[in-house]
Interface confidence: medium
């Protein structure tokens, strides 16, 4: 492993569309892939009138935007669907929205996924 890199071997899995996609609704997903590729965890969610609605969580393919991120943080300002990715086992258990704004001070909104992860 590259020095300082946090290897991702498994991620929290969740799929709101699990029945149609023929998957489990929630669980732990092992992350497979070529040995020369980095693997990440991700989370996507919506904010419906202040209520967090998780869309999907799981493993994510090698993506430079996820490199060396130990926390799953969305930095875009008010996206329609929030997305974050990270490196490290189960790093997508918690995710947060931390918009990068020029003037106002950023505020963190950590989210604990529901339903909770289980083996």
């Amino acid at each position: 492993a590259i020095l300082g890199r946090s290897e991702t071997q498994e991620c929290l899995f969740f799929n709101a569309n699990w029945e149609k996609d023929r998957t489990n609704q929630t669980g732990v997903e092992p992350c497979y892939g070529d040995k020369d590729k980095r693997r990440h965890c991700f989370a996507t969610w919506k904010n419906i009138s202040g209520s967090i609605e998780i869309v999907k969580q799981g493993c994510w393919l090698d993506d430079i935007n996820c490199y060396d991120r130990t926390d799953c943080v969305e930095k875009k300002d008010s996206p329609e669907v929030y997305f974050c990715c990270c490196e490290g086992n189960m790093c997508n258990e918690k995710f947060s929205y931390f918009p990068e704004m020029e003037v106002t001070q950023p505020t963190s909104n950590p989210v604990t996924p529901k339903p909770p992860y289980y083996n």
Epitope: K20, D21, E29, Y32, T44, V55, C59, D63
Partner: antibody, heavy 120, light 107 residues
């Protein structure tokens, strides 16, 4: 080197059956979900079916549901597509392709394809 | 099913040109969008996955952008070997669906 080699294509009459195989090498086969994608002559790509690493999940296009069955034998590093009740519109080149996860469906390696012709 | 609409269906360009192909999904697919290149008589080849990430061995002149419903594949400087048909594909939901393809021809 990753290799996927399809076989089993050929000419078959409407209503007939064929079994396609895809022999995989150069990677750990049972780490990957596998897919069949087809392409009718002069047309675009159409997803046909997929199966996850341990055969726990399978998915089919509506156009083949109930007629085609996807399966795999991890001990033989081989993917299969059993095609029954074939129709003229099933005529196509059939490709097998791999994907890292069930929902991570970027198809990063493809076979060269095998041609299935359904005609009387 | 999620419909994928690609445009244009064909285009003529010269070596060195900047080429842009667009793909629109009928509903949000987050970043689950992949691009493939196919040459006559050959299997498709993965170019871009997760909307923006280049696959192994793909030249840097190929880039992808977009999220949600609108996506773009850009070839910054067209090379002779780039004349081919390009397909987008969504992998957000089953069934997986492809765009109709964009044929890039020599002007």
């Amino acid at each position: 080197e990753v290799q996927l080699l399809e076989s089993g294509g050929g000419l078959v009459q409407p209503g007939g059956s064929l079994r396609l195989s895809c022999a995989a090498s150069g990677f750990t086969f049972d780490d990957y979900s596998m897919h069949w994608v087809r392409q009718a002559p002069g047309k675009g790509l159409e997803w046909v079916a997929s199966i996850n690493y341990n055969s726990g999940y399978k998915g089919y296009a509506d156009s083949v549901k109930g007629r085609f069955t996807i399966s795999r034998d991890n001990s033989k590093n081989t993917l299969y597509l059993q095609m029954n009740s074939l129709r003229a519109e099933d005529t196509a080149v059939y490709y097998c392709a791999r994907a890292a996860n069930w929902h991570d469906t970027a198809l990063d390696y493809w076979g060269q394809g095998t041609l299935v012709t359904v005609s009387s | 099913d999620i419909q994928m609409t690609q445009s244009p269906s064909s285009l003529s360009a010269s070596v060195g040109d900047r080429v842009t192909i667009t793909c629109r999904a009928s509903q949000s697919i987050l970043r689950y969008l992949n691009w493939y290149q196919q040459k006559p008589g050959k299997a498709p080849k993965l170019l871009i996955y997760a909307a923006t990430s280049r696959a192994s061995g793909v030249p840097s002149r190929f880039s992808g952008s977009g999220s949600g419903t609108d996506f773009t594949l850009t070839i910054s400087s067209l090379q002779p070997e780039d004349f081919a048909t390009y397909y987008c594909q969504q992998s957000d939901n089953l069934p997986l669906t492809f765009g109709g393809g964009t044929k890039v021809e020599i002007k």
